[in-house]
Interface confidence: low
């Protein structure tokens, strides 16, 4: 006859490991008992259990409550046992010794491999600001046995670097994602993907990128200077910028205080009916936590009477 087992049994931490041992005997052969022992190299054999054809399973004190027979129906030639709730310390070599009658004793070894699935964590880098050079966006760490694979899934351009630390029974892998921050990255997902044979599917942790920036400021409203004439109603200047965090706006006049009647409404400066008093240099100051910007424009309120006088002169001169 011959003994059938597996070279390697792989189980995830906390699961039950079936240690197979089946004697395929010739007709008339019987299995008397099956002895299971742990036989790691350099250490003496440590008995797990004895499975007897008549008296059932006897478990050694060190494994009390952890070794069982598979549920029925059982084949009398099957010496397999279940090792409950596998832990990392269970990883190693096991030997099944089958005593048969009349053929004698057979033995086989298997290796138990206990997979420790990683529990990944994602940590952010420093606050991202537009204008920085290559900056750490996030690091992702996963420890398991065997060493997990840590990669990144994102549309954002960047560079990755990984390092591994080996421990006695596991390995920790850390991957860093570096990028050059730009405003287009705001709100983009950066996903750490951890693969491991102990996981049914990849573990994914997503971090939303937040990049602080402040765009250049510009002022709208002076596109047609001819509209800025005495008496005009509803004239306004609007300050344009964008940023993250959203910016605040402040209006001043460079050559004096804001004229009376001029209304400041956030990014908009509203004028009462225009007079020559409204001529001047106006400054829009935009700021957020990240930066500040200024934009200034010169308002020149025209006097239609002066203009028409000039036109008459020109006509008479022609």
């Amino acid at each position: 006859g011959e003994l059938e087992t597996s070279d390697v049994v792989t189980v995830v931490l906390g699961q039950d490991a079936k240690l197979p041992c089946f004697y395929r005997g010739d007709s008339g052969e019987q299995v008397g008992q099956v002895a299971w022992a742990r036989v790691d190299a350099g250490e003496g054999a440590q008995e797990l259990a004895l499975l007897h054809s008549k008296y059932g399973l006897h478990v050694s004190p060190a494994y009390e409550g952890r070794v069982e027979q598979p549920p029925p129906p059982r084949n009398p030639l099957d010496g397999s046992v279940l090792l409950r709730n596998a832990v990392q310390a269970d990883e190693g070599e096991y030997e099944c010794r089958v005593s048969t009658f009349p053929a004698g004793s057979f033995q086989a070894r298997l290796r138990l491999r206990v997979l420790v699935p990683p529990l990944p964590s994602l940590n952010p880098g420093p606050a991202l600001e537009e204008g920085q050079g290559l900056t750490l966006a996030a690091s992702c760490t996963a420890e398991g046995s065997p060493a997990p694979s840590v990669t990144w899934d994102t549309e954002v351009k960047g560079t990755t670097s990984s390092r591994s630390f080996k421990h006695s029974r596991s390995a920790a892998v850390t991957s860093e994602f570096h990028l050059v921050p730009s405003r287009s990255m705001n709100g983009q997902p950066l996903t750490c993907v951890v693969s491991h044979p102990g996981l049914l599917q990849d573990q994914r942790i997503t971090h939303i990128l937040h990049v602080s920036f402040l765009a250049e400021a510009s002022v709208r409203g002076l596109e047609d200077q001819n509209l800025w004439h005495i008496g005009r109603e509803g004239a306004m200047l609007k300050c344009l910028s964008e940023g993250q965090p959203p910016p605040s706006y402040n209006w001043t006049r460079l050559d004096g205080p804001l004229p009376s009647g001029v209304r400041v409404d956030g990014d908009t400066l509203g004028f009462p009916p225009l007079t020559t008093e409204h001529s001047g240099i106006y400054v829009c100051h935009v700021s957020n936590e990240f930066s500040s910007r200024d934009s200034q424009v010169t308002v020149d309120v025209l006097d239609p009477q002066e203009d028409s006088g000039k036109q008459v002169d020109l006509v008479s001169a022609s």
Epitope: L122, N123, P124, A138, I205, H207, Q244, P245, E289
Partner: nanobody
Framework: EVQLLESGGGLVQPGGSLRLSCAAS????????MGWYRQAPGKEREFVSA????????YYADSVKGRFTISRDNSKNTLYLQMNSLKPEDTAVYYC????????WGQGTQVTVSS
């Protein structure tokens, strides 16, 4: 152990207000961006708002801009979401999350907007 405990949900009429709170423990709260997410029945969980570790930077989904305000008190390890001008479409379970580490979630608090 990381724990996030939301409170403040309830039933409110359209146009009304609610203030959600999220008490955090088990980690260095003041070092992390925090966020609010929500999940309406039959829909995927969606981003609502986030706030930087110092509280200076805030971010909002377009659907809540101008109505919701996120804030935090680092001395109390607490995150807030002030919700004004509530609409029926704001009805959902609202979750607090460690934003940078989106696998840590609270249990959620139900917000129902109905007349």
């Amino acid at each position: 152990e990381v724990q996030l405990l939301e409170s403040g949900g309830g039933l409110v009429q359209p146009g009304g207000s609610l203030r959600l709170s999220c008490a955090a423990s088990g980690f260095a709260y003041s070092s992390y961006y925090m966020g609010w997410y929500r999940q309406a029945p039959g829909k995927e969980r969606e981003f609502v708002s986030a706030i930087s570790s110092s509280g200076g930077g805030t971010y909002y989904a377009d659907s809540v801009k101008g109505r919701f305000t996120i804030s935090r008190d680092n001395s109390k390890n607490t995150l807030y979401l002030q919700m004004n001008s509530l609409k029926p479409e704001d009805t959902a379970v609202y979750y607090c999350a460690v934003e940078l580490t989106y696998n840590y979630w609270g249990q959620g608090t139900q917000v129902t907007v109905s007349s």
